[in-house]
């Protein structure tokens, strides 16, 4: 047994240092532009290798039932790249805006870029000298000062434009010990606003020949956000390159060169004056609707995943926003035999599913003051700022003839309570503001509207179960807003917080 | 809640080398930054060095050029290779960890570095 184990080990060895040396990154100090060529990545190392394998042993083997393999028809769901072929080119100090779906590859793309996640095809070229902005502000132990210079040398002009920039003067100036104040242990503690800005302020003092800016206003205020955007990202920095992830309608007509991403892919790269001459159902869409960027940063990427579902290159014709599918919530074969007898009606009771408590200190995704993460079990609706699905489409890995069967299945799976059988989706409906929403990226029905109201206006718990087929009536798919699969990175962001 | 435990602390000649590791457990999925602090007799506790989400690594002045922070982050682990180690490098050496969207901050509970001829 020991000698196969080493056989084994050796072979795989020498597999590894026959494989050809790949230089997908190309850092070059005099370079000033920015590019990324046909970039495709997966989440795991080796993934598309594996990934053309499952394929093929797939084509060979058949299960019993004469369907094909079970794993290998899982694996194809779980195989989607994280990104697929990226294309775009930026010349020294430009701002390249990026926006997109919910789990469409926006911070994996900053990853790539920084030689975190390591592309299968492609090149990426630009000097190495990045600073990089997380869309999770954080702080060390330490003062105000420290935690903005630490590790890079001081320069007091540079400081104090930043400090300027950023809008920490107000802050910075009540305090007695100025910017000698201590954070953290021992010390004051911040808002998630200023917290945002302290950590927009280390990234944009580091020098460097590329800013990484992965949503870097939550917290802040829609007017405190134009602000710190203008004073900060476009004259501060104006002739540094900058790369911002964004969903705002305001920073894509700023920018020099917006790039959408829809699904880990492409879906529009360009000016903003190219995209409405290029797609003006899209653009209009996003602009006619009414202060769209006055929207929670939630609710924008909940829109703006809708429209690009519906107005995706690959899917069919565009739908207007007023027309809606009626198709009946209906089953057939296997699909049926799995459900449960009853169901719940999310107008006879409340809905058990995706209702998240908030606290006064919770409005809008804000987690102000509060000492440790609240822990994410219920919630499908991405919160916060961020905008990246942290929990995904339920059942990832489940089977089917069809891909829209299989994310109707599992939508029923999670009413049931026929995944996830140990997650308690009960809750005393204690507070004032809840969300309701079936999928991270379905924009309000009328149910959800209603059953948000009526949640509002009971303080009962959540128990009446009634029969399923009055839920058929009042659940309908729209096919274009439905995403057919799961992405790689929503299902790898699902792993990672919850590996422990 | 997070834990850190530190490792490799110990009695060195001036000049010498040490590696220190520290591995994070417990509620480990959004880590935002990991790093060391030092604490030097009838001092204040003080950064070293630090290495934050997309590798951004940053050195207090006193230690750079001689101190490289690295991360395993399949493992949560984060290690400090101290090389050309003087006299004045002499502290408790406490791992660091800042995680989750609020920003919480955890501690090892520090491991003695001494050098010392």
């Known amino acids: 047994q020991t000698w196969y184990d080493s056989l084994g080990a050796i072979n795989k060895i020498q597999d590894f240092l026959q494989k050809q040396e790949y230089k997908t990154l190309e850092y070059n100090l005099t370079t000033t532009e920015v590019v990324m060529e046909n970039v495709t990545a997966f989440w795991e190392e080796g993934f598309g290798e594996l990934f053309e394998k499952a394929k093929q042993n797939n084509n060979n083997r058949k299960t019993s039932n004469g369907d094909d393999s079970l794993f290998f028809s899982n694996f194809s769901l779980l195989g989607t790249p994280v990104l697929k072929d990226i294309n775009f080119k930026i010349e020294r100090g430009q701002l390249l805006a990026v926006a997109g779906s919910t789990g469409a590859g926006k911070t994996s793309l900053l990853m790539v870029i920084m030689g975190e996640l390591e592309p299968s095809e492609g090149k990426i070229k630009h000097s190495g000298r990045i600073s990089f902005c997380s869309q999770f502000s954080w702080i060390m132990p330490g003062t105000i000062k420290e935690n903005i210079i630490f590790g890079v040398s001081y320069d007091e002009y540079r400081y104090r434009s930043v400090i300027k920039a950023c809008q920490l003067e107000e802050d910075i100036s009540k305090f007695a010990e100025k910017d000698n104040i201590v954070l953290g242990e021992g010390g004051i503690t911040l808002s998630g606003g200023q917290r945002a800005r302290i950590s927009l302020a280390r990234a944009v003092y580091k020098d460097a020949d590329l800013y990484l800016l992965d949503s870097p206003f939550g917290y802040l205020d829609v007017l405190t956000e134009k602000e710190i955007f203008e004073s900060c990202v476009c004259k501060l920095m104006a002739n540094k390159t900058r790369i911002l992830v964004t969903s705002k309608m305001e920073h894509l007509k700023k920018a020099d060169k917006i790039l959408i991403l829809h699904e880990g892919s492409s879906y529009f790269y360009g000016t903003f004056s190219e995209l409405q001459n290029l797609q003006p159902d899209f653009s209009s869409k996003l602009m006619g609707c009414d202060s769209f960027d006055q929207f929670s940063a939630e609710r924008r990427n909940s829109i703006l995943t809708e429209t690009l579902h519906r107005f995706s290159l690959e899917g069919d014709a565009p739908v207007s926003w007023t027309e809606t599918k009626k198709q009946s919530f209906k089953q057939t074969g296997e699909f049926g035999e799995k459900r449960k007898n009853s169901i719940l009606n999310p107008i006879n009771s409340i809905r058990k599913f995706s209702i998240v408590q908030k606290t006064p200190l919770q409005m809008n995704g804000i987690e102000e003051d509060s000492d440790e993460p609240l822990e994410r079990r219920l919630s499908l609706v991405p919160d916060s700022e961020q905008g990246e699905a942290i929990l995904p489409r339920i059942s990832v890995i489940s089977t089917g003839p069809t891909l829209q069967a299989r994310r109707r299945q599992s939508v029923l799976n999670l009413m049931t309570h026929s995944v996830n059988q140990g997650q308690n989706i009960h809750r005393k409906t204690t507070a004032s503001t809840r969300k309701v929403s079936l999928a991270p990226q379905a924009n309000l029905t009328e149910l959800d509207i209603y059953s948000r109201r009526l949640s509002q206006e009971t303080g009962l718990e959540i128990s009446e179960e009634i029969n399923e087929e009055d839920l058929k009536e009042c659940f309908f798919d729209d096919m274009e807003s439905i995403p057919a699969v799961t992405t790689w990175n929503t299902y790898l962001r699902y792993i990672t917080v919850h590996k422990s | 809640q997070v834990q850190l435990q530190e490792s490799g602390g110990g009695l060195v000649q001036p000049g010498g080398s040490l590696r220190l590791s520290c591995a994070a457990s417990g509620s480990t999925s959004s880590i935002n930054a990991m790093g060391w602090y030092r604490q030097a007799p009838g001092k204040q506790r003080e950064p070293v060095a630090i290495?934050?989400?997309?590798?951004?690594?940053r050195y207090a002045e006193p230690v750079k050029g001689r101190f490289t922070i690295s991360r395993d982050n399949a493992q949560n682990k984060v290690y400090l290779q101290m090389n050309s180690l003087k006299p004045e490098d002499t502290a408790v050496y406490y791992c660091?960890?800042?995680?989750?969207?609020?920003?919480?901050?955890?501690w090892g509970q520090g491991t003695q570095v001494t050098v010392s001829s």
């Open positions: 290495s934050s989400s997309g590798g951004d690594t």
């Open positions: 660091w960890l800042n995680w989750g969207r609020t920003s919480v901050n955890s």
